[in-house]
């Protein structure tokens, strides 16, 4: 089979600070040295890019400075963290993995992680 399998958890609950973390694991059919990981958000059949990073195997995963994502890599596993989430960001987050180099190129699309975000209740004013 020439398809690359990507596994990610079905559901994740964001913290009260709007932070969600999940693992994206891919079964590499080849010995990739350059990998690109993209987090996509799917809502009402519309797909948008949340963040993306390209890394060399054995090196750290580096997102752009203004990205809402951070991550670390270990072998064929990527630990992804998305920050600054609010209730309106609840949705399906898809992990996309591309083995860019060396040939052949492989594409892997995960089934998506449903991230639930609950906005914290505002603290009531205290009278002292």
């Amino acid at each position: 089979c020439k398809a690359m399998h990507v596994a990610q958890p079905a559901v994740v609950l964001a913290s009260s600070r709007g932070i969600a973390s999940f693992v994206c694991e891919y079964a590499s059919p080849g010995k990739a040295t350059e990998v690109r990981v993209t987090v996509l958000r799917q809502a009402d059949s519309q797909v948008t890019e949340v963040c993306a990073a390209t890394y060399m195997m054995g090196n750290e995963l580096t997102f752009l400075d203004d990205s809402i994502c951070t991550g670390t890599s270990s072998g064929n596993q990527v630990n992804l963290t998305i920050q600054g989430l609010r209730a309106m960001d609840t949705g399906l987050y898809i992990c996309k993995v591309e083995l860019m180099y060396p040939p052949p190129y492989y594409l892997g699309i995960g089934n998506g992680t449903q991230i639930y975000v609950i906005d914290p209740e505002p603290c009531p004013d205290s009278d002292f």
């Epitope: 089979c1 020439k2 398809a3 690359m4 399998h5 059919p29 350059e34 690109r36 993209t38 996509l40 797909v47 948008t48 890019e49 993306a52 390209t54 898809i94 996309k96 860019m100 180099y101 040939p103 052949p104 190129y105 492989y106 594409l107 699309i109």
Partner: antibody, heavy 118, light 108 residues
Framework: EVQLVESGGGLVKPGGSLRLSCAAS????????MHWVRQAPGKGLEWVSF????????YYADSVKGRFTISRDNAKNSLYLQMNSLRAEDTAVYYC???????????WGQGTMVTVSS | EIVLTQSPGTLSVSPGERATLSCRAS???????LAWYQQKPGQAPRLLIY???SRATGIPDRFSGSGSGTDFTLTISRLEPEDFAVYYC?????????FGQGTKVEIK
């Protein structure tokens, strides 16, 4: 408007060269991989070449390897195909296509005709 | 290289009837990586189905895709006059990206 517009096609003699361009608009060009696909008269679709987001990774069909070079300029939202040592069998309509976020070619240009004949 | 074989080469159907197009791969293709395109004379191809069964934006629900592994199907439930065209399947899970040779759907 989200679109791709090819240019640069024409009539060229065998052994000659041609440079095709594809101008992208209406989307963040650097967030997508890009491809060239061709279609010989009355024939099916044939993938020609691929280029990664930053232009560092490139792949080619065996039929054009060593003769064609794909490149992109993200600052200009443009994709290119330099075609050298052209042969009669390279005669085709050449399309640029966007590799969609989930992989399929979700946006195509209108195509530009390349005719290789003496 | 994954070779895609489409059948039949030509399908003659009357408007309003159902059309069933087949695409067979030389080796297993993950269903997430199989697409169908429609092409009319003088026009660029248009994405219809991706991920074997998901309709692209703006594609009417009379178009549906199914299948997994090596066998995939595009079904047009009730052919409209504008559906007479050539249809191509494609795999995009690994390089080289490959297309089937196409099925022409013509008016009977």
């Amino acid at each position: 408007e989200v679109q791709l517009v090819e240019s640069g096609g024409g009539l060229v003699k065998p052994g000659g060269s041609l440079r095709l361009s594809c101008a992208a608009s209406g989307f963040t060009f650097s967030s997508y991989t890009m491809h060239w696909v061709r279609q010989a008269p009355g024939k099916g679709l044939e993938w020609v070449s691929f280029i990664s987001y930053d232009g560092n990774t490139k792949y080619y069909a065996d039929s054009v390897k060593g003769r064609f070079t794909i490149s992109r300029d993200n600052a200009k939202n443009s994709l290119y195909l330099q075609m050298n040592s052209l042969r009669a069998e390279d005669t085709a309509v050449y399309y640029c296509a966007r590799g969609g976020l989930l992989g399929p070619f979700d946006l195509w240009g209108q195509g530009t005709m390349v005719t290789v004949s003496s | 290289e994954i070779v895609l074989t489409q059948s039949p080469g030509t399908l003659s159907v009357s408007p309003g009837e159902r059309a069933t197009l087949s695409c067979r791969a030389s080796q297993s293709v993950g269903s997430s990586y199989l697409a169908w395109y429609q092409q009319k004379p003088g026009q660029a191809p248009r994405l219809l189905i991706y991920g074997a069964f998901s309709r692209a934006t703006g594609i009417p629900d009379r178009f549906s895709g199914s299948g997994s592994g090596t066998d995939f199907t595009l079904t047009i439930s009730r052919l409209e006059p504008e559906d007479f065209a050539v249809y191509y399947c494609q795999q995009y899970g690994s390089s080289p990206w490959t297309f089937g040779q196409g099925t022409k759907v013509e008016i009977k």
